[in-house]
Amino acid sequence: LSTCKTIDMELVKRKRIEAIRGQILSKLRLASPPSQGEVPPGPLPEAVLALYNSTRDRVAGESAEPEPEPEADYYAKEVTRVLMVETHNEIYDKFKQSTHSIYMFFNTSELREAVPEPVLLSRAELRLLRLKLKVEQHVELYQKYSNNSWRYLSNRLLAPSDSPEWLSFDVTGVVRQWLSRGGEIEGFRLSAHCSCDSRDNTLQVDINGFTTGRRGDLATIHGMNRPFLLLMATPLERAQHLQSSRHRR
Amino acid sequence: LSTCKTIDMELVKRKRIEAIRGQILSKLRLASPPSQGEVPPGPLPEAVLALYNSTRDRVAGESAEPEPEPEADYYAKEVTRVLMVETHNEIYDKFKQSTHSIYMFFNTSELREAVPEPVLLSRAELRLLRLKLKVEQHVELYQKYSNNSWRYLSNRLLAPSDSPEWLSFDVTGVVRQWLSRGGEIEGFRLSAHCSCDSRDNTLQVDINGFTTGRRGDLATIHGMNRPFLLLMATPLERAQHLQSSRHRR
Amino acid sequence: ALDTNYCFSSTEKNCCVRQLYIDFRKDLGWKWIHEPKGYHANFCLGPCPYIWSLDTQYSKVLALYNQHNPGASAAPCCVPQALEPLPIVYYVGRKPKVEQLSNMIVRSCKCS
Amino acid sequence: ALDTNYCFSSTEKNCCVRQLYIDFRKDLGWKWIHEPKGYHANFCLGPCPYIWSLDTQYSKVLALYNQHNPGASAAPCCVPQALEPLPIVYYVGRKPKVEQLSNMIVRSCKCS
């Protein structure tokens, strides 16, 4: 390896090795290595090995150290948003109103206009404005899967609050799926968390865009703050890595 | 600031400013700044400002950029494990066996022996060995809260599998709570995820340590692999930041 | 990414992760760590050419910018990006201990 | 932590985050970014003394090790640790765009 002057690779390795000596001792807060004079002879006890192995092995559901940011993430993302289809749309009629759930549908043609290809999408968030909430509520988000089935996505424990607050759910994978499929309308369901033995499954939280009986200006403001998808995507022209320095739309 | 030679702070700032020029343009993949000749006069459109603001503001449930590792995390953690109280213990008699749940109890005196003070605990994982699973199963973990109430902790979607696999749940906060309280025995419940409108709530997954009728050696092996808490904690003596360079027990 | 997959199989002269296996006994003269016997520590090495100034040809450097100075530093430096922990077994007196050391293994590097 | 809380209120000579506000118009001569008008970019600066060698007094350096060379580099370097993104509004022709630029604001530094 050469920069201005040649790098002595062996010297760098020796310095790294010496640095590791200090690193390990300092991490263990030892001023010197412990003496081995009284270490019992023979192999390590089974229990110790088992403990070492369970520490060493990654297991399902354990988060690995964060992956390095993919190169694509270095580049800027264009941000767009797609509002939920308004609640007077006939799509909502198919889903009986219930005390435990609310439904949110999106027009995939609007999504495709914002993000022409699934691979360009780097993040999609479902954003909901929750109004004030008197009691703690555990909610779950589902994705409409097939005819009348729903796939669980995530959950959130909502603390009581006197003021409205935006909630955000990462739905990148779901929106990427939708962009790949041919459907016209796709949706989410927000439900109360239902425990197997609990009977009180009412969705207490009030989400902006669902309360009825609003008129005129108030309804418009209310509608603007209805649930939406916030999309971050690499613009198509940037993704094409064109050598031209043009600013394409 | 001085190292061997004086650092010219103004020069560093100028270089950083120039680097930012390149950084912004390269992130936008622009070879030069876009012309402003066709920009409409007047303020930015409301919709654009709203979009900019929702991108700028952090919202509830959105993960912030990762916090830098606390200093305490730099130092090594001692790893111990505490096995679940065996299922023939009378504590289990109080909880009626159900098709949707299994219960796991732990002796807090064993936990305290491993981690004398709550503040020393840096991570606690509940580890379960799941045996082969024929169908996808969505499970939830609860913490025993008060007399007969349970607090939801987390959930996991288990994919079908032909081979046994360790599952891990982060229960650091819960174990820290237990260490602060006076209870003798504390526990978890693993349940099938029960949807508000679903009727089939059976826990299909088979967790090692709960299947009955095992004898002799097999039961021992089975028992060794029963659920346990894997604890990572700062050893008491290391936490005391003694200036002494001693290697204490 | 300047990770082990790319760097170990290339002759990259600029910033990259370099192979380094530490044998506790041979390299550090230590026999007190009972498990593992050693580990792939690796290290970051290589220049991060400073590639931006007012008189630079804009378009020529854009493609290189991400790799050489993504953080827009005044003097970019080749440093670890992804790190992994290392569990060890050692004895204090007669008592075995299992400890996990954070950020011990360099998996990838970056110019920062 | 070598973050803005600590570094902006101290006279730390070693590695620390330093204040730097970028005004797009004044500093870069740009008027094409409509929002924000500028941002606190900050930067990392200061030495990371190399504090380990075979002849070093072990006990004296242990307390310093975490801050100066936690990653056990052969030549530790003062680099960003926590970074934040920056959203901007600009026009391409007549069309306004909102874009988020990752890792633009330095919140803390580390020796790496």
């Epitope: 030892l30 001023a31 010197s32 290595p33 412990p34 003496s35 081995q36 004079g37 009284e38 | 360079s245 001693r246 290697h247 204490r248 027990r249 | 003269g29 230590w30 026999k31 204090v92 007196g93 007669r94 | 002849d55 007094q57 072990y58």
Partner: antibody, heavy 118, light 107 residues
Framework: EVQLVQSGAEVKKPGASVKVSCKAS????????MHWVRQAPGQGLEWMGR????????KYAQKFQGRATLTVDTSTSTAYMELSRLRSDDTAVYYC???????????WGQGTLVTVSS | DIQMTQSPSSLSASVGDRVTITCRAS??????LNWYQQKPGKAVKLLIY???VLETGVPSRFSGSGSGTDYTLTISSLQPEDFATYFC?????????FGQGTKLEIK
């Protein structure tokens, strides 16, 4: 301040036994092993054995196996070394020393002179 | 058992002199080598452990070096209070063994 204070000098006849005490203060007695070392007149230091005050576990140098007995009283933070069947070549200064797991004796008692003479 | 051979057995020097004492082990002791100072009627005092680590409170004129089987204690500039007997000890393997000692006297 960490201190080890030993009992006073003893004169014993051959064949007799001697019991030397070592009282610890300034640290948690059960956190460190206590070792015993002796030094015959004009000679070097010789390790005799150790006791773990927490468990009472002992380890002796082969030479002293069966003749030396190490005990502790944790209620008073005191360690004892008893040497039986004394011979004239057991005349020495006997030291208790606190052991650090780094492999060294970091605190020593002032020593107890035991003289074996007929 | 590991044999420790210390040399010289005695040494005369003056205040301000630089003095070196060596210790050789019969096998590799992996740097687990400690140095002690003994004065008549006083408790033995730890000076250096693990070859080169200075015990808290010990003046910096004392230093240690070495590896494998050969180790050295150096006093860079003798002070009047340094005249005493010095012992080395290995902490690598049981039984712990000591050198025979070096008596440092005023010339």
């Amino acid at each position: 301040e960490v201190q080890l204070v030993q009992s006073g000098a003893e004169v014993k006849k051959p064949g007799a036994s001697v019991k030397v005490s070592c009282k610890a203060s300034g640290y948690t007695f059960t956190s460190y092993d206590m070792h015993w070392v002796r030094q015959a007149p004009g000679q070097g230091l010789e390790w005799m054995g150790r006791i773990d005050p927490q468990s009472g576990g002992v380890k002796y140098a082969q030479k002293f196996q069966g003749r030396a007995t190490l005990t502790v009283d944790t209620s008073t933070s005191t360690a004892y070394m008893e040497l039986s069947r004394l011979r004239s070549d057991d005349t020495a200064v006997y030291y208790c020393a606190r052991w650090d797991y780094g492999g060294y004796f970091d605190v020593w008692g002032q020593g107890t002179l035991v003289t074996v003479s007929s | 058992d590991i044999q420790m051979t210390q040399s010289p057995s005695s040494l005369s020097a003056s205040v301000g002199d630089r003095v070196t004492i060596t210790c050789r082990a019969s096998q590799d002791i992996y740097n687990y080598l400690n140095w002690y100072q003994q004065k008549p009627g006083k408790a033995v005092k730890l000076l250096i452990y693990y070859t080169s680590v200075l015990e808290t409170g010990v003046p910096s004129r004392f230093s240690g070096s070495g590896s494998g089987t050969d180790y050295t204690l150096t006093i860079s500039s003798l002070q009047p209070e340094d005249f005493a007997t010095y012992f080395c000890q290995q902490g690598d393997e049981l039984p712990w063994t000591f050198g025979q000692g070096t008596k440092l006297e005023i010339k």
